[in-house]
Amino acid sequence: SGPVKELVGSVGGAVTFPLKSKVKQVDSIVWTFNTTPLVTIQPEGGTIIVTQNRNRERVDFPDGGYSLKLSKLKKNDSGIYYVGIYSSSLQQPSTQEYVLHVYEHLSKPKVTMGLQSNKNGTCVTNLTCCMEHGEEDVIYTWKALGQAANESHNGSILPISWRWGESDMTFICVARNPVSRNFSSPILARKLCEGAADDPDSSMV
């Protein structure tokens, strides 16, 4: 029995739970998901029983080995998987636990602008990046392009201070999770600040 193995998969994709055994006479291998039996294998008997019929098409054993491949992943496949290898040659079953996290492929992140002010020719605002569907474990970073050196900023909120007359800047939000990344539409500082240009003391949402 080894330490818990953490696995990551994407919705619609596949994941393989690695399993090896040097036991000669394996009587049975039992896979469970959150305490519910998933598959029972009897290598000598040549039988593989998938407990729920709907999972039959999703279960495979690459290269005829003991590792279990689960495909067409869904969000609710996330959870704890457990395998026990039972053999008359073992005093107790050999076991392994896995934790699977299934993530969605990220859609394009949405950017909203906070309160904007324009004082002394400087446009000041916040840009907030977020996912419309509230996906989990998303990390946001901002890329600011166009100054002498390109800059990065961590976090979903980017504070902006852009002075009229400076070269235009482009802001892009990058959203990442363990299986994908996506980019917002680029936002130009000049366009963003145009609304406040006429009235040096204006503020808008």
Partner: antibody, heavy 120, light 108 residues
Framework: QVQLVQSGAEVKKPGASVKVSCKAS????????MNWVRQAPGQCLEWIGR????????KYNGKFKGKATLTADKSTSTAYMELSSLRSEDTAVYYC?????????????WGQGTLVTVSS | DIQMTQSPSSLSASVGDRVTITCKAS??????VAWYQQKPGKAPKLLIY???YRYTGVPDRFTGSGSGTDFTLTISSLQPEDFATYYC??????????FGCGTKVEIK
């Protein structure tokens, strides 16, 4: 990648013996059953027996007990099948084939076959 | 020993055809049946094990089904490279394992 390479064709006289070898590579030889299967001209495939190289344990088809002897050498990852008291009906192509782990009776990798001809 | 009776012994078909081969075991073998493809002068190649599990790399036009005593191999749309002889084999519990005598799939 997994490979099973068998020894070359043999021509033997009735009553003689022959030893066919099967050299394995690309996997842990000692941890998988090795099967032997024969295919006589115009006949069905016949399972002869299998050996577990890790400890030399063997299982035979009753029809081939006393006819075939299976052995394995872990140091060279080679399996052997010896056929004794050869008769003309033993003329066949003999294959070694590795068992899958998940279903030990299913065979996923096969040697290229060794033709044994028994003729006076 | 368990007998495996395969039918038909040969069949003629065209590229694109759906082909079905059946195998009957003389006693219950649960789902412990494998299917192999063999081309002249070559070793058999594993297609399906445990009745319905496609071996790695086998195209999904090959499908195995059945349990108990009746088993089927279906090729959904025959391709030029599929013309060969197909064998069923029971791999249930204690050996000996036994094979069907083959179905030769020929070009019509």
């Amino acid at each position: 990648q997994v490979q099973l390479v068998q020894s070359g064709a043999e021509v033997k006289k009735p009553g003689a013996s022959v030893k066919v070898s099967c050299k394995a590579s690309g996997y842990t030889f000692s941890s998988s059953w090795m099967n032997w299967v024969r295919q006589a001209p115009g006949q069905c495939l016949e399972w002869i027996g299998r050996i577990y190289p890790g400890d030399g344990d063997t299982k035979y088809n009753g029809k081939f007990k006393g006819k075939a002897t299976l052995t394995a050498d872990k140091s060279t990852s080679t399996a052997y099948m010896e056929l004794s008291s050869l008769r003309s009906e033993d003329t066949a192509v003999y294959y070694c084939a590795r068992s899958t782990m998940i279903a030990t009776g299913a065979m996923d990798y096969w040697g290229q076959g060794t033709l044994v001809t028994v003729s006076s | 020993d368990i007998q495996m009776t395969q039918s038909p012994s040969s069949l003629s078909a065209s590229v694109g055809d759906r082909v079905t081969i059946t195998c009957k075991a003389s006693q219950d073998v649960s789902t412990a049946v494998a299917w192999y493809q063999q081309k002249p002068g070559k070793a058999p190649k594993l297609l399906i094990y445990s009745a319905s599990y496609r071996y790695t790399g086998v195209p999904d036009r090959f499908t195995g089904s059945g349990s108990g005593t009746d088993f089927t191999l279906t090729i959904s749309s025959l391709q030029p490279e599929d013309f060969a002889t197909y064998y069923c084999q029971q791999h249930y519990s204690t050996p000996p394992y036994t094979f069907g005598c083959g179905t030769k799939v020929e070009i019509k």
